[in-house]
Amino acid sequence: VPDKTVRWCAVSEHEATKCQSFRDHMKSVIPSDGPSVACVKKASYLDCIRAIAANEADAVTLDAGLVYDAYLAPNNLKPVVAEFYGSKEDPQTFYYAVAVVKKDSGFQMNQLRGKKSCHTGLGRSAGWNIPIGLLYCDLPEPRKPLEKAVANFFSGSCAPCADGTDFPQLCQLCPGCGCSTLNQYFGYSGAFKCLKDGAGDVAFVKHSTIFENLANKADRDQYELLCLDNTRKPVDEYKDCHLAQVPSHTVVARSMGGKEDLIWELLNQAQEHFGKDKSKEFQLFSSPHGKDLLFKDSAHGFLKVPPRMDAKMYLGYEYVTAIRNLREGTCPEAPTDECKPVKWCALSHHERLKCDEWSVNSVGKIECVSAETTEDCIAKIMNGEADAMSLDGGFVYIAGKCGLVPVLAENYNKSDNCEDTPEAGYFAIAVVKKSASDLTWDNLKGKKSCHTAVGRTAGWNIPMGLLYNKINHCRFDEFFSEGCAPGSKKDSSLCKLCMGSGLNLCEPNNKEGYYGYTGAFRCLVEKGDVAFVKHQTVPQNTGGKNPDPWAKNLNEKDYELLCLDGTRKPVEEYANCHLARAPNHAVVTRKDKEACVHKILRQQQHLFGSNVTDCSGNFCLFRSETKDLLFRDDTVCLAKLHDRNTYEKYLGEEYVKAVGNLRKCSTSSLLEACTFRRP
């Protein structure tokens, strides 16, 4: 019988008492085969973290800073359940740390030196740790003691709770630096008042502070937010302009064997019976003998944290950077305007080979990081382990939802001004063998399908989106008799046709021979009835252009396209017979790396781009013998995006809507995780 006990860790007598009450009340409402609570008492949160890591306890609820500690080795804990605030309809699990300024003040984030600062309090998250952590490497040396460095960075501050004797500049705007509401500039509202009164130039608070203090929109319009990219935005655009997004209060567990499903089952049942306004005799979110015991008193309920989400992703790149800077206190030798090497994310060992070759030829401008799937690469870019990669539009969508931005687009047509002219896109098509003359768009049910990969544009999002509109369900593996759609569940019929050996079967990388455009076409040639690819795929792999044994004798004339009106056309008539126009592949990165990735990639393509004529004796960035490694092989150049510099603008309203409709069919664990952070 599996042990269904969750050992909750309590950090005080009062918490232990509430925990025992929680245990007893749960016993009274949950059947004997359901989850139960046991209580473990420790002296501190850090002791609780160690106890969970050592399998002496299973769960505890922590503030963001402690979630970071819990994640660090050797603890390796992960977030499993989040408290939410506000309403069930609009649950808030995060708040945003922001830098508020007056509208007419005219400086940016990188010009804060010498300004006057208002803080909620020394050592507090939004008011101190996050802004000072992010500014850490700009502080004058020596950076220890930190208070002294901060005092020398700003021309005056109010940092309640600071030592006014040792660091008078930190109390210059609020004499005494009182650590309670007796100090008019203490806390969120106090720090905002410090700005409003004109004492300070910038207030470090949370996104809701300005709304709580200024009910009138006209008054709020006198203020702006400083963004990390050295721009400003209106105060209601905090989701796109903040210092960090911070989880409020989170239950953590072991990463391996951590009982996360059991913990969720327990807490979900607990909120049903003892949540807000549920029971008089025991309330989960109330602390008669103290404050915030086990859970925050202000919480309204729990949400399950998606399983794909580790602590780094949950806390977010900015928050982790700020806290790591403060804790480790390490900075680059001297901040320079020169770009650091771009860490390119390579998928599996084929891309890694090409990336290694690029790296040595780039003389230190490019470094390589490996991952097994595109989603793993996106996650690595999000958390700073990697910086950039080129993605199909379907993954540009996921990357965008995860906070990454497109920076350059692949262009596939030769033109005089390639780098300045991003193209409208390529065509997604359905290819069949000419010999299967009865096959049309309208009778694909029960046929064998070949896809580039799940989540990709031409191979999945466009054809499956059109199919979904017809069949109104997501069971595509029942619609086709079998197929190869790399990235599907291994036991799905959509992995049956795949050719990868062992663990590589149906993997969404080049270890699966039927992966990508060329792979999907090969799948059609060898096993399938229809392939969903791009309009250039057939000509690129026929007429001897692909020398691989399976392709070298193929003839373009032996294939036709399926048109949406039920007719068929020759391959060259793709402009009048396609499923949809697809956005070109694009390079994505984090916002903080955008300028450097843009600069370095433009240099790299001038050295190794289409201007290189002999690829047998020189490194060619856009060539890999039909394998589309790192970039599509038909890339002519990487083009500037001009104003199409967000994923929505880049992909276009129509495509974003189409992928949005398919979201209900999505199996992307990363998309689920990212929409948890930003619904």
């Epitope: 070759e357 040595v360 030829n361 080049n510 047998s616 490194f619 013998e625």
Partner: nanobody
């Protein structure tokens, strides 16, 4: 297409040295980039060092300062000088010229290096 053959491996004590050679069946002068990879038991093949025709080099962090890559275009040979060897350097070492056959997983036999006391 030029064929490459690795040699020079063997058993060596920790702290010892070895020099691996990669001999080509034809001219390597026109080959832009060459590299050494290794595969440790149960692990993915990984880059050890790479070198371009112009002499730019790149090393894995774990071998920086201990290993040195070079090529002699006149002798159509590339070398890997390995000093201060550690047990974790134990692997099969392969050389590559980054031609299309490596994207097809068509690698040579490699040469076994074992570092043990």
């Amino acid at each position: 297409q030029v064929k490459l053959e690795e040699s020079g491996g063997g058993l060596v004590q920790p702290g010892g040295s070895l020099r691996l050679s990669c001999a080509a069946s034809g001219s390597i002068f026109s080959i832009n980039t060459m590299g050494w990879y290794r595969q440790r038991p149960g692990k993915q093949r990984e880059l050890v060092a790479a070198i371009t025709r112009g002499g730019n080099t790149n090393y894995a962090d774990s071998v920086k300062g201990r290993f040195s890559i070079s090529r002699d275009n006149a002798k159509n040979t590339m070398y890997l000088q390995m000093n201060s060897l550690k047990p974790e350097d134990t692997a099969v070492y392969y050389c590559t010229d980054y031609s299309r056959r490596y994207y097809q997983d068509d690698w040579g036999q490699g040469t076994q290096v074992t570092v043990s006391s």
